[in-house]
């Protein structure tokens, strides 16, 4: 009815789009909620974050397990009072993902 | 002054976060602007899209060249008038990216 090879290609495509940890570029300052007078060089780091598709539109690809990776970055404060400092920055790294439904907010929260 | 090895690691991290085409999961129906009574199986495909960091906050990682990839998918229209049809779907695939300044919208547009 449908060509078996085509179906195989489609299935492989589907497997690759599934919700899973994917290498993502994350902006450190916004990730850490730092004030605008603190910035980092480089401003971004590579970590794994959950992404991809779920087979129901109402489900969301969410992290089920997380590790924290330490990245060495230059922290620069403005106005420059001292030389840029090399600091270890801990960034969340998603190690497990799952398509999950949303839970209603508590009506009184 | 700074350990050469550490600087090398930081530089490599920075290179990897640079604005470039990255494999991304794209929802086909919303990509094509289809109505909610047309959907695809699988609902998502893998293509390359521009992503990553720019070294100035005012710049945006944007595509400078695009190709169109044809993906074989099942198109399902509701109400179901026929069996799901295998159709070639053309999806934009970013082949070149650049950090570009945002163009201000015309105040009267």
């Amino acid at each position: 009815f449908y060509d078996i090879e085509t179906l195989k290609v489609i299935d492989e495509e589907w497997q690759r789009t599934q919700c899973s940890p994917r290498e993502t570029c994350v902006e450190v300052a916004s990730e850490l909620g730092k004030s605008t007078n603190t910035f980092f060089k480089p401003p971004c780091v590579n970590v794994f974050r959950c992404g991809g598709c779920c087979n129901e539109e109402s489900l969301i690809c969410m992290n089920t397990s997380t590790s924290y990776i330490s990245k060495q970055l230059f922290e620069i404060s403005v106005p420059l009072t001292s030389v840029p400092e090399l600091v270890p920055v801990k960034v969340a790294n998603h190690t497990g993902c799952k398509c999950l439904p949303t839970v209603p907010r508590h009506p009184y929260s | 002054f700074y350990d050469i090895e550490t600087l090398k690691v930081i530089d490599e991290e920075w290179q990897r976060t640079q604005c470039s085409p990255r494999e991304t999961c794209v929802e086909v129906a919303s990509e094509l602007g289809k109505s909610t009574n047309t959907f695809f199986k699988p609902p998502c495909v893998n293509v390359f899209r521009c992503g990553g960091c720019c070294n100035e906050e005012s710049l945006i990682c944007m595509n400078t060249s695009t190709s169109y990839i044809s993906k074989q998918l099942f198109e399902i229209s509701v109400p179901l008038t026929s069996v799901p049809e295998l159709v070639p779907v053309k999806v934009a695939n970013h082949t070149g990216c650049k950090c570009l300044p945002t163009v201000p919208r015309h105040p009267y547009s």
Epitope: W14, Q18, N55, E56, E57, S58, I60, K98, C99, P101, T102, V103, P104, R105, P107 | T36, F39, K41, P42, P43
Partner: antibody, heavy 117, light 112 residues
Framework: EVQLQQSGPELVKPGASVKMSCKAS????????MHWVKQSHGRSLEWIGY????????YYNQKFRDKATLTVDKSSSTAYMQLNSLTSEDSALYYC??????????WGQGTSVTVSS | DIVMTQTPLSLPVSLGDQASISCRSS???????????LHWYLQKPGQSPKLLIY???NRFSGVPDRFSGSGSGTDFTLKISRVEAEDLGVYFC?????????FGGGTKLEIN
């Protein structure tokens, strides 16, 4: 044509358990979640939970977490629901339902469970 | 849990009349993705429920155009423009935005 064929009626004793089946055909079994719903007194519908046949991931309504266990057999495109420690409260009609991308779209014919001593 | 309240409980109509069923949710059904997962099902006597309308206003496969859905947020309506004998049964609204998925108590459409 999408079809969900459920197993026949069950008459069981209180405290026992029951395992019902739902055989899917007419579509790619692993591409769609399978939900289960309980209908009692011919009217009230309660959602039990769902299973993703692709990877076996399950999600249960808190109320049924200790009552129901959802499983699948991919080779036969069949979903199963086991109910344990049955009481008269569990007497009802149980449906398996395929979840389309937007909504639960196709329902099985239902499996009737009667708990009686 | 989100409570779905349907009115009326019973709706006697004459064939050819318009019928209107209301469904109210205890919380907004707007998902964080912007969609509203409010669906309508019809259960005819001795049968399993069948999907009629999905995502507020989209008719499912094979559903006649005399059926229409509308509403937003917490208030939704199913309308049947000209009731036919085959439309009789119990109508349920259901929300698929949050877990647990919940259903309305049903509205029985019967002949006057």
């Amino acid at each position: 044509e999408v079809q969900l064929q459920q197993s026949g009626p069950e008459l069981v004793k209180p405290g026992a358990s029951v395992k019902m089946s739902c055989k899917a055909s007419g579509y790619s079994f692993t591409g769609y979640n399978m939900h289960w719903v309980k209908q009692s007194h011919g009217r009230s519908l309660e959602w039990i939970g769902y299973i993703d046949p692709y990877n076996g991931d399950t999600y249960y309504n808190q109320k049924f977490r200790d009552k129901a266990t959802l499983t699948v057999d991919k080779s036969s495109s069949t979903a199963y629901m086991q109910l344990n420690s049955l009481t008269s409260e569990d007497s009802a009609l149980y449906y398996c339902i395929r979840a389309g991308y937007y909504a639960m779209d196709y329902w099985g014919q239902g499996t009737s469970v009667t708990v009686s001593s | 849990d989100i409570v779905m309240t349907q009115t009326p409980l019973s709706l006697p109509v004459s064939l050819g009349d318009q019928a209107s069923i209301s469904c109210r949710s205890s919380q907004s059904l707007v998902h964080i993705n912007g969609n509203t997962y409010l669906h309508w099902y019809l259960q005819k006597p001795g049968q399993s429920p069948k999907l009629l309308i999905y995502k507020v206003s989209n008719r499912f496969s094979g559903v006649p155009d005399r059926f229409s859905g509308s509403g937003s947020g917490t208030d939704f309506t199913l309308k049947i423009s000209r009731v036919e004998a085959e439309d009789l049964g119990v109508y349920f609204c259901s929300q698929g935005t949050h877990v647990p998925r919940t259903f309305g108590g049903g509205t029985k459409l019967e002949i006057n």
